[in-house]
């Protein structure tokens, strides 16, 4: 028998520095977690103690903090090189700055193979990107060879900006021939490493003949055997065992997100490459694990540029940006409109001639808007200003909801109106009218939504049985502010870009902004 240790991360999302327990900015260092310096300490400890170790990343290193905004992926290559990752799969967020924003900072600089078997380049891009990412890589590990086959969510064109010259194929269809090829070349230990979410990971384990282990990402799935060490609630045991169609027991793993945990899986193979046993657990990277001093020093060196960036002007406003709780928790506020407009603008994807865009709607809890921005400071807007408006380090995500769920959400928005509570929704691509004289749960009297399958966008009444795409904060997607119906009834959820980054990009693009209060949210006569 031969034993392999797989160390894995996924959805790190630019958390190079240690973070608080909820993966936001570290405040009290003695209680902070994760970060590449701490990760390196643990990885090195395991590498020294065990003979056959692979360090893998399942995608979405890009996007999530000011580190990515400023360094644009160069920080990912640099620190992943320093940690000596053995392989990485491409995630959807790796395409957030377009293909060039992937090629130059990461693909050309990474000193580890970057993988995806289901992304095929065409046209002029094919020769430009040739060899920069691979469908698979065969690695020598101790006395054996291990094949690693990559995959990426085929939804990426709707979630990011891969352009028109990359085709995202069905994962299973693309993986099978690559695995078959490796088998014919006597590679009998194969790991599928990818970024399509836990449901697809399980399907790959079930359907792709010859895959021995699946290491996944995208869905931020936390798996654990025994008593979990922090706040995350396990979605199942670690590893999650799937019985394949050909009768094999295939371990599937994922390690939550944000570099909070290091996945740790031990696999025992027989001489024919069959998995005999698998066990392990994610390791919580808490403050009991010291940060490596040399990596920490490097982080501090790279940090300097971030501090300078946060005070630079992104653009100007010529109007007061009303982000006060007195406005945003009671009525339409122009800060809410600005943020929603930025959210939609960030999700412009012309992937189908029948649609002017794949999504037109935005909802945003008023309680998530934490500060106004005064235009009387020469109109200047900085990252620092935006960090005061959106201090929680969240993301603006894409969900699919039925009309009936949206109606419930808008009823919840005003079910206890007048108490300055955070659930009052700011909107984009939606016209809502409330009648507060009616009883809670029956106050939405008009709800019109902007069409997507149209050449001239116009507002049509919401249809209860239709499925709609909506951009919203991850806080709402996770049921925050009492929006349990969103969490319980959403049909799909894909994590998006860092909230501040979305707004800062929009402001930089527009240069000068002047958002108005324009009648997106109305109250019927006599009730307000």
């Amino acid at each position: 028998a031969w034993e392999l240790t797989i160390l894995h991360t996924n959805d790190v999302h630019s958390r190079l520095e240690q973070t608080s327990e909820d993966s936001s900015k570290c405040v009290n260092a003695s209680r902070c977690m994760g970060g590449v310096a701490r990760l390196f300490t643990k990885v090195q400890q395991i590498r020294r103690a065990e003979p056959n170790v692979l360090l893998l990343d399942a995608g979405d290193q890009y996007q999530g903090t000011i580190w990515f905004t400023v360094y644009k992926g160069a920080e990912v290559a640099h620190f992943m090189n320093a940690l000596r990752y053995d392989a990485m799969a491409l995630g959807n967020h790796e395409f957030d700055n377009g293909v060039e924003g992937l090629i130059e900072p990461l693909l050309k600089e990474a000193k580890f193979p970057i993988l995806s078997a289901n992304i095929k380049a065409k046209g002029p891009l094919a020769s430009q990107i040739s060899g920069l990412y691979l469908p698979y890589k065969v690695l020598p590990v101790g006395d054996e060879v291990v094949g690693i086959v990559g995959y990426t969510s085929k939804e990426t064109p709707f979630l990011s900006n891969p352009g028109t010259n990359l085709v995202f194929e069905d994962e299973i269809t693309a993986l099978q021939p690559e695995v078959d090829k490796l088998k014919t070349l006597n590679v009998n230990k194969i790991i599928a490493l990818g970024h399509s979410g836990f449901e697809m990971d399980k399907l790959i384990a079930q359907k792709v003949r010859g895959v021995d282990v699946v290491v996944g990402g995208h869905s931020n799935t936390f798996l654990y055997t025994g008593n979990p060490p922090s706040k995350e609630v396990p979605a199942g045991k670690y590893p999650f065992i799937v019985t394949s169609d050909d009768g094999r027991k295939v371990p599937v793993v994922q390690a939550y997100a944000f570099g909070k945990y290091l996945g740790y899986l031990k696999i025992e193979f027989d001489e024919r490459g069959n998995v005999i046993s698998s066990h392990g657990n994610p390791i919580l990277l808490n403050s009991s694990i010291p940060e490596d001093p040399s990596i920490k020093a490097d982080i501090n060196k790279w940090r300097i540029k971030l501090d300078n960036y946060s005070t630079q002007e992104l653009g100007k406003t010529i109007v007061y940006l009303d982000g006060s709780s007195q406005s945003c928790r009671f009525r339409e506020c122009n800060m809410g409109n600005l943020i929603c407009d930025a959210m939609i603008n960030n999700n412009l994807r012309h992937t189908d001639e029948m649609f002017w865009n794949h999504v037109s709607m935005c909802i945003l809890n008023g309680g998530g808007i934490r500060s106004p921005i005064d235009e009387r400071n020469n109109g200047t807007i900085t990252w620092e200003n935006l960090a005061a408006v959106l201090p929680f380090g969240g993301t603006f995500d894409l969900v699919q909801l039925k009309g009936s769920t949206l109606k419930k959400a808008f009823e919840h928005s005003v079910h206890r109106y007048g108490q300055s509570t955070g659930e009052f929704l700011q909107v984009g691509g939606i016209h809502v009218v409330y009648d507060l004289s009616r009883k809670p749960g029956d106050r939405v009297v008009k709800l019109d939504v902007l069409c997507t399958k149209c050449r001239v966008p116009s507002y049509d009444p919401l249809k209860m049985d239709e499925v709609y795409k909506v951009i919203l904060p991850n806080f709402l997607a996770n049921g925050g502010d009492g929006f349990q119906m969103i969490k319980d009834e959403l049909l799909r959820h894909d994590s998006g870009d860092q909230d501040i980054n979305v707004v800062s990009t929009y402001i930089s693009k527009m240069k000068v902004i002047y958002p108005a209060v324009e009648g997106r949210i109305k109250f019927s006569t006599g009730s307000h």
Partner: antibody
Framework: QVQLQESGAEVKKPGASVKVSCKAS????????MDWVRQAPGQGLEWMGD????????IYNQKFKGRVTMTRDTSTSTVYMELSSLRSEDTAVYYC???????????WGQGTLVTVSS | DIQVTQSPSFLSASVGDRVTITCKAS??????LSWYQQKPGKAPKLLIY???RLIDGVPSRFSGSGSGTEFTLTISSLQPEDFATYYC?????????FGGGTKVEIK
């Protein structure tokens, strides 16, 4: 700068064994695998095998399986290649070569000529 | 094992010429192809890896291209120091295998 210093030329009788050394300097020895390649007089290059200096793991070309042994000594940053049951067709220059992150051979030793003759 | 066939075996050219050497693998090698230059009595020197990535310090007149099973090394304008033997090698799977070599001679 990266340097790979190989041991001196050897003359061996058929049936004997030879052990060639390769001392590495200018980089972290355990961070890169080492390959061995040989070249018979006037001929092309032939890959013999690979050793991971970190854990001593080896992958050999089946053609040499049972005859070749690759080892390492981390205290001196040296790898060794021993070839046994020598025959005349093993007369060749033997090179050690460091592999880069992608496993291409980016730095080579100067070569050790092994002559097998009765 | 994957077979790697290099052509031509010999090539006569003049300084300033554009020279192309091809390498064919018996099956798709996933861009895992390197090119080496060897001068008489010396060890090989890595020029290009991953089919088209030029090693630091190697003159830009050298370039690699190709994917799948067919690869090319091009020297855009041959210089006196480029007369040598060139080898391609696949490192997609084990055992690693080399092409038979192309000797570039002065015409």
């Amino acid at each position: 700068q990266v340097q790979l210093q190989e041991s001196g030329a050897e003359v061996k009788k058929p049936g004997a064994s030879v052990k060639v050394s390769c001392k590495a300097s200018g980089y972290t020895f355990t961070d890169s695998n080492m390959d061995w390649v040989r070249q018979a007089p006037g001929q092309g290059l032939e890959w013999m095998g690979d050793i991971n200096p970190n854990n001593g793991g080896t992958i050999y070309n089946q053609k040499f399986k049972g005859r070749v042994t690759m080892t390492r000594d981390t205290s001196t940053s040296t790898v060794y290649m021993e070839l046994s049951s020598l025959r005349s067709e093993d007369t060749a220059v033997y090179y050690c070569a460091r592999t880069n992150w992608d496993y291409a051979m980016d730095y080579w030793g100067q070569g050790t000529l092994v002559t097998v003759s009765s | 094992d994957i077979q790697v066939t290099q052509s031509p075996s010999f090539l006569s050219a003049s300084v300033g010429d554009r020279v192309t050497i091809t390498c064919k693998a018996s099956q798709d090698i996933n861009s895992q192809l390197s090119w080496y230059q060897q001068k008489p009595g010396k060890a090989p020197k890595l020029l290009i890896y991953r089919a088209n990535r030029l090693i630091d310090g190697v003159p830009s007149r050298f370039s690699g291209s190709g994917s799948g099973t067919e690869f090319t090394l091009t020297i855009s304008s041959l210089q006196p120091e480029d007369f040598a033997t060139y080898y391609c090698q696949q490192y997609d799977v084990f055992p690693r295998t080399f092409g038979g070599g192309t000797k570039v001679e002065i015409k």
